[in-house]
């Protein structure tokens, strides 16, 4: 808390501007009118403001909005967003993309803060789904983020929005996720050909049955063993050696080199000698 | 639902061979989706594998014990066993069996037996 | 064979404390790794499959996450029952491999 003072003659602010980062604390506390502040707070980021005097910027701010701050301020926190608490910005309320890319500019480059996490929370939920724009923006912004979201949160991702995801953005989903992803990536790219379905449906495929990648065997697709070893066990295990011989195409060679890893060893195991030996690999079922 | 006992000798020389039997009951060894596995707990140390074999007969072992191990499955009695070979004071812990599902893990272990190779 | 060293090999935490277990594979086990629970004298009990799915049975504060090499358990609020050493163990190369244990104890 700063204490209350009075401003001395001749220092009330009358703008924001770079003679404000000569004001001790107490004076910027005393001499800066909150109503101010707020209705240009987007000056406040061209200044090289310390930390310390950022707190008392904030502290501001609170006082004149205890119930949260508008988008219009929101939108020019800049810098002054760091500042912030996941408390302070479980209050807001945001509903424009523009805010929200302002924010996640401010924090490029790092990893996912609290913050982030609760501004997009709040973001997604004050829009009742993740839209392909949003999601556009927050994959951009975090390659990561689609995944590490919860099975739960993954299910209000309307079909229309898979059309934003990218192969990168499932690096790090796991199967649950996946399982949840598929069958909207499945609705969204029903009505494209055989193989452009199959490499927009390839990054998805972690989340597939065992139907559907018998019905792929029989499409020439040639999956490549990456992408064989992101399926399911249980969608894989039951597939025959001439299947996994169809679907794979030319990669059905690179079943040696995967041979100890799952679910490669798994779908081995449990196929017949006779059968593993029509694939010349040398496996050992 | 599945449960597992290990049986054997507790006390093993050096140099000798441990033998031990687990038996499945309420379950079958010959399940589709079942690998089963032994895994071993030195007194007051951590859990190491040993192996595992699949009903077809099929095996997979550590690499560290490979040369010592032998697992093997009766599928008419619904039991499997392990067989290591040239024991020192090492080997003793205690031995678990445990059924091993493709699509989760160990998820059912029998109670565990000590052995101990002493002369 | 894939190294999983976990950390820290012993904690202690009070009832209600928030507890995260670490455990970093040697290379890669994409997300086949599985957490386990063992009190005194009895046999491991699975907890998490496939590095963050909850095994029937499990209490809902036990979560886990992570890919790649690097994983985590999480007990959101420790009960009296959760005292005991913690095991990670990775499934995707046929050599099977455990961590070293985290010991949970009393403060």
């Known amino acids: 808390e700063v204490e209350k003072t009075a401003c001395p003659s001749g220092k009330k602010a009358r703008e924001i501007d770079e003679s404000l980062i000569f004001y001790k604390k107490w004076e910027l506390e005393a001499c800066v009118d909150a109503a101010l502040l707020a209705t240009q707070m987007d000056r406040v980021n061209a200044i090289p403001f310390t930390y310390e005097q950022l707190d008392v910027l904030k502290h501001k701010l609170d006082e004149l909005y205890p119930q949260g701050y508008p988008e219009s301020v929101i939108q020019h926190l800049g810098y002054l967003f760091l500042k912030m608490s996941p408390e302070d910005i479980r209050k807001w309320n945001v509903t424009s993309l523009e805010t929200l890319k302002a924010l996640l500019e401010v924090n490029k480059g790092h990893e996912m803060s609290p913050q982030v996490a609760t501004l997009i929370d709040r973001f997604v939920k004050g829009r009742g789904q993740l839209d392909k724009d949003t999601l556009d923006t927050l994959t951009a912004f975090y390659p990561g983020y689609l995944c590490s979201l919860s099975p739960e949160e993954l299910s209000s991702v309307p079909p229309s929005s898979i059309w934003a995801v990218r192969p990168q953005d499932l690096d790090t989903c796991d199967p649950r996720q996946l399982d949840v992803l598929y069958p909207k990536a499945r609705l969204a790219f029903q009505n494209m050909n055989g193989s452009e379905y199959f490499v927009k449906i390839q990054s998805f495929l972690g989340g597939a049955p065992t139907e559907d990648l018998k019905a792929l065997s029989q499409q020439n697709v040639s999956m490549d063993l990456a992408t064989f070893m992101k399926l399911r066990t249980d969608a894989v295990l039951p597939l025959t050696v001439a299947e996994v011989q169809k679907l794979l195409g030319p990669h059905v060679e690179g079943l040696k080199a995967e041979e100890r890893h799952r679910p490669v060893r798994d779908w081995i195991l449990r196929q017949r000698q006779d059968d593993l030996d029509t694939l010349g690999l040398g496996l050992q079922g | 639902q599945v449960q597992l006992q290990e049986s054997g000798p507790g006390l093993v020389k050096p140099s000798e061979t441990l033998s031990l039997t687990c038996t499945v009951s309420?379950?079958?060894?010959?399940?589709?989706?079942?690998?089963w596995s032994w895994i071993r707990q030195p007194p007051g140390k951590g859990l190491e594998w040993i192996g595992y074999?699949?009903?077809?007969?099929?095996?997979n072992y550590n690499p560290s014990l490979k040369s010592r191990v032998t697992i093997s499955v009766d599928t008419s009695k619904n039991q499997f066993s392990l067989k290591l070979s040239s024991v020192t004071a090492a080997d003793t812990a205690v031995y678990y069996c445990?059924?091993?599902?493709?699509?989760?893990?160990?998820?059912?272990w029998g109670q565990g037996t000590m052995v101990t190779v002493s002369s | 064979d894939i190294q999983m060293t976990q950390s820290p090999s012993s904690l202690s935490a009070s009832v209600g404390d928030r507890v995260t277990i670490t455990c970093r594979a040697s290379q890669s086990s994409r997300y086949y790794v599985n957490w386990y629970q063992q009190k005194p004298g009895k046999a491991p009990k699975l907890l998490i499959y496939a590095a963050s799915s909850l095994q029937s049975g499990v209490p809902s504060r036990f979560s886990g996450s992570g890919s790649g090499t690097d994983f985590t358990l999480t007990i959101s609020s420790l009960q009296p029952e959760d005292f005991a050493t913690y095991y990670c163990q990775q499934s995707y190369d046929a050599s099977y491999t455990f961590g070293g244990g985290t010991k949970v104890e009393i403060k």
């Open positions: 445990a059924r091993e599902d493709a699509l989760t893990g160990f998820d059912i």
């Open positions: 309420g379950g079958s060894v010959s399940s589709y989706y079942s690998t």
């Open positions: 074999i699949y009903y077809s007969g099929s095996t």
